[in-house]
Interface confidence: medium
């Protein structure tokens, strides 16, 4: 089954409320447009990053209210017998594909560790995040293309796995995504991505950005 239908709906974060609002706004403005979800998520997170604490406040209030609702409902909720056990995760199920950022990290993490052996895991992650944000979109393309191909493969694999409906069905069919030709990094100056510095033009129905947004 799909879990207990009586179980209270999970609590939403302030960011989740913000994304929900974005989607509703977009639906109103472009009722017929099909949404490119990776692009949508990217734009949402960029907009969220540039918002002031005051602007985020209303979403934080919504999250607080929702948390209170969740806690209130959970007090009276009695889970059905045997539902407390963690859901079985099939080790043979196709693995979720890595994101473009993850692929970028895999390539650059050893370089950072080599150059700065004393850095903590957190600092390495922070540095990787900064490097990614300062890589222009044209130079993100190799990682994005590779991630898109792996995602496509994963979707086929997971569909086949579900169609077979047996936990070990994936054993034969799921081949580790073959390592696609590693991008020979050209040693280039890393530049800010134009859309990092996005300002919102409220009058403007269209939110315009620099050419590196794709």
């Amino acid at each position: 089954g799909k879990g207990d239908p009586k179980k209270p709906r999970g609590k939403m974060s302030s960011y989740a409320f913000f994304v929900q609002t974005c989607r509703e706004e977009h639906k109103k403005k472009h009722p017929d447009a099909s949404v490119n979800f990776s692009e949508f998520s990217k734009k949402c997170s960029e907009r969220w990053k540039t918002m002031s604490a005051k602007e985020k406040g209303k979403f934080e209030d919504m999250a607080k209210a929702d948390k209170a609702r969740y806690e209130r409902e959970m007090k009276t909720y009695i889970p059905p017998k045997g539902e407390t056990k963690k859901k079985f995760k099939d080790p043979n199920a196709p693995k979720r594909p890595p994101s473009a950022f993850f692929l970028f990290c895999s390539e650059y993490r050893p370089k950072i560790k080599g150059e700065h052996p004393g850095l903590s895991i957190g600092d390495v992650a922070k540095k990787l995040g900064e490097m990614w944000n300062n890589t222009a979109a044209d130079d993100k393309q190799p990682y994005e293309k590779k991630a898109a191909k792996l995602k496509e493969k994963y979707e086929k694999d997971i569909a086949a796995y579900r169609a077979k409906g047996k936990p070990d069905a994936a054993k034969k069919g799921v081949v580790k995504a073959e390592k696609s030709k590693k991008k020979k990094e050209e040693e280039e100056d890393e530049e800010d991505e134009e859309d990092e510095e996005e300002e919102e033009d409220e009058e403007d129905e269209e939110e315009e950005e620099d050419d590196d947004d794709e």
Epitope: H26, K43, E188
Partner: antibody, heavy 125, light 108 residues
């Protein structure tokens, strides 16, 4: 509606100079990298120059064929982009287009990009 | 870095035509396709290999495999007669690249 309108084309002699302009409207110009693309009569499209935004220090890039002779610049307060062409050669004869590629709409990519109608530059003695 | 396109292609009205674009960087870079009508107006018809811009007919589709990107036009109409250019970015410190263009003739 988005508009890019080029002006300033004309007939000049080899080794002379000419400055063409592009007036942009209908989008947040200061957030847009701008390009000049040209097309010689009967030939294909060729990227000529690119200028990035203020956060990127208005970095400029040029095709090898025009390096050292052409200068791209912009005035964000006027939503204008310019191409100063010095020491012109007969092979610079072309239709010059101003373009703002790879735009986005709202929060979802529309993939649309904007082109001007072009301005003709003829270099002939 | 070059993008190679066939100089011309022809198709009978209502049929399907494919135009190819080859370049060593295409496994790692996105291909974009432009249509230039006889009046010289330029419109992008495909971006990021296979995405269609808003306002472009769903008769236009794009794909990319290895070093080749392909633009396909199904149910070709007379108004599709135009020059088609592929373009790809190279790396951020260089200008993008255009293919030489393919002149599409619609017969019948």
């Amino acid at each position: 509606a988005v508009q890019l309108v080029e002006s300033g084309g004309g007939l000049v002699q080899p080794k002379e100079s000419l400055k063409i302009s592009c007036a942009a409207s209908g989008f947040t110009f200061s957030n847009a990298a701008m390009y000049w693309v040209r097309q010689a009569p009967g030939k294909g499209l060729e990227w000529v120059a690119r200028i990035r935004t203020k956060p990127n220090n208005y970095a400029t890039y040029y095709a090898d064929s025009v390096k050292g002779r052409f200068t791209i610049s912009r005035d964000d307060s006027k939503s204008m982009v310019y191409l100063q062409m010095d020491n012109l050669k007969t092979e610079d004869t072309a239709m010059y287009y101003c373009t703002a590629p790879r735009r986005t709409e709202g929060i979802v990519s529309s993939g649309v990009d904007y082109w001007g109608q072009g301005v003709m530059v003829t270099v002939s003695s | 870095y070059e993008l190679i396109q066939p100089p011309s292609a022809s198709v009978t009205l209502g049929n399907t035509v494919s135009i190819t674009c080859s370049g060593d960087e295409l496994p790692k870079r996105y291909a974009y396709w432009y249509q230039q009508k006889p009046d010289k107006s330029i419109v992008r018809v495909i971006y990021k290999d296979s995405e269609r811009p808003s306002g472009i007919s769903d008769r236009f589709s794009g794909s990319s495999s290895g070093t080749t990107a392909t633009l396909t036009i199904r149910g070709t109409q007379a108004e599709d007669e135009a020059d088609y250019y592929c373009h790809s970015t190279y790396s951020d410190d260089k200008l993008p690249v255009f293919g030489g263009g393919t002149k599409l003739t619609v017969l019948g």
